[in-house]
Amino acid sequence: MMTGTIETTGNISAEKGGSIILQCHLSSTTAQVTQVNWEQQDQLLAICNADLGWHISPSFKDRVAPGPGLGLTLQSLTVNDTGEYFCIYHTYPDGTYTGRIFLEVLESSVAEHGARFQIP
């Protein structure tokens, strides 16, 4: 039985040209994490394998950095980076867990303005 849960950063915003860390955390299970795949809609961004380490898709190499941990850092953000991101945890013996993050990339002034009104 799959008992684990994925905690994510949820809905996040960042400013154009900046960077953001996408982070997921698997909890409530003793299953071994064998691999984490990061996807943006229908594109494979990166894979972190327990044995082989990180593989970043060549088309994203300039703007995607591995880590911290099993997370992923997106750099030089553009408005086109707005959308859904998925962390897919492959575990043994549980199977697959999936987490979802929605990233909105805003023009600099909008992002700064919005930040003033965030609830702590």
């Epitope: 691999q35 594109q43 494979l44 894979i47 044995d51 492959h90 043994y92």
Partner: antibody, heavy 118, light 107 residues
Framework: EVQLLESGGGLVQPGGSLRLSCAAS????????MHWVRQAPGKGLEWVSG????????SYADSVKGRFTISRDNSKNTLYLQMNSLRAEDTAVYYC???????????WGQGTLVTVSS | DIQMTQSPSSLSASVGDRVTITCRAS??????LNWYQQKPGKAPKLLIY???SLQSGVPSRFSGSGSGTDFTLTISSLQPEDFATYYC?????????FGGGTKVEIK
């Protein structure tokens, strides 16, 4: 240099058994998932079975489930396919393959021919 | 099981031609789609992985595109050594499945 060398193929009667081996060298065998893929004469490619890097997880095509068993010995850098209750339709060249990240096959062996015939 | 439908099953082309092969999945497979080249009597060779990533050592005239259900392999300028059979393969879920193949022949 990555090398995968299959052996154990040959002629066997229907209902018989064979054990294929794949000796791996040139890479850290224990870090990679490994698969078997077959190709019947003049036909396309058909995935047969796969095994995780530590051998803890295996999967099979429906056509071989219950008859074939995949295993590996990481201390010997060797992948195996035990084939029982063989049928004429199992006649094919069997390739062992390295599967980084479980997503693509980057290296294939040269293949070993299994012929099931009376 | 996910079915992979490749087209055309064969084509005739000349050296220098631009060749396009398509592959359609029966359900969305994100970008978990690979392309292989096989010559008679030889093992397949990886060309493109994850829909659009060029495998190391493969000439840049080969390219892949697509996501979801529809994918394309393009050879921008066909060379004599490119006459072979090409297969797509999905690795989104087991059982892994291959397309039926496209044989590229000399016109």
């Amino acid at each position: 240099e990555v090398q995968l060398l299959e052996s154990g193929g040959g002629l066997v009667q229907p209902g018989g058994s064979l054990r294929l081996s794949c000796a791996a060298s040139g890479f850290t065998f224990s870090s990679y998932a490994m698969h078997w893929v077959r190709q019947a004469p003049g036909k396309g490619l058909e995935w047969v079975s796969g095994i995780s890097s530590n051998g803890g997880s295996t999967s099979y095509a429906d056509s071989v489930k219950g008859r074939f068993t995949i295993s590996r010995d990481n201390s010997k850098n060797t992948l195996y396919l035990q084939m029982n209750s063989l049928r004429a339709e199992d006649t094919a060249v069997y390739y062992c393959a390295r599967v980084p990240y479980g997503v693509w096959i980057d290296y294939w062996g040269q293949g070993t021919l299994v012929t099931v015939s009376s | 099981d996910i079915q992979m439908t490749q087209s055309p099953s064969s084509l005739s082309a000349s050296v220098g031609d631009r060749v396009t092969i398509t592959c359609r999945a029966s359900q969305s497979i994100s970008s978990y789609l690979n392309w292989y080249q096989q010559k008679p009597g030889k093992a397949p060779k990886l060309l493109i992985y994850a829909a659009s990533s060029l495998q190391s050592g493969v000439p840049s005239r080969f390219s892949g595109s697509g996501s979801g259900t529809d994918f394309t392999l393009t050879i921008s300028s066909l060379q004599p050594e490119d006459f072979a059979t090409y297969y797509c393969q999905q690795s989104y879920s087991t059982p892994l499945t291959f397309g039926g193949g496209t044989k590229v022949e000399i016109k």
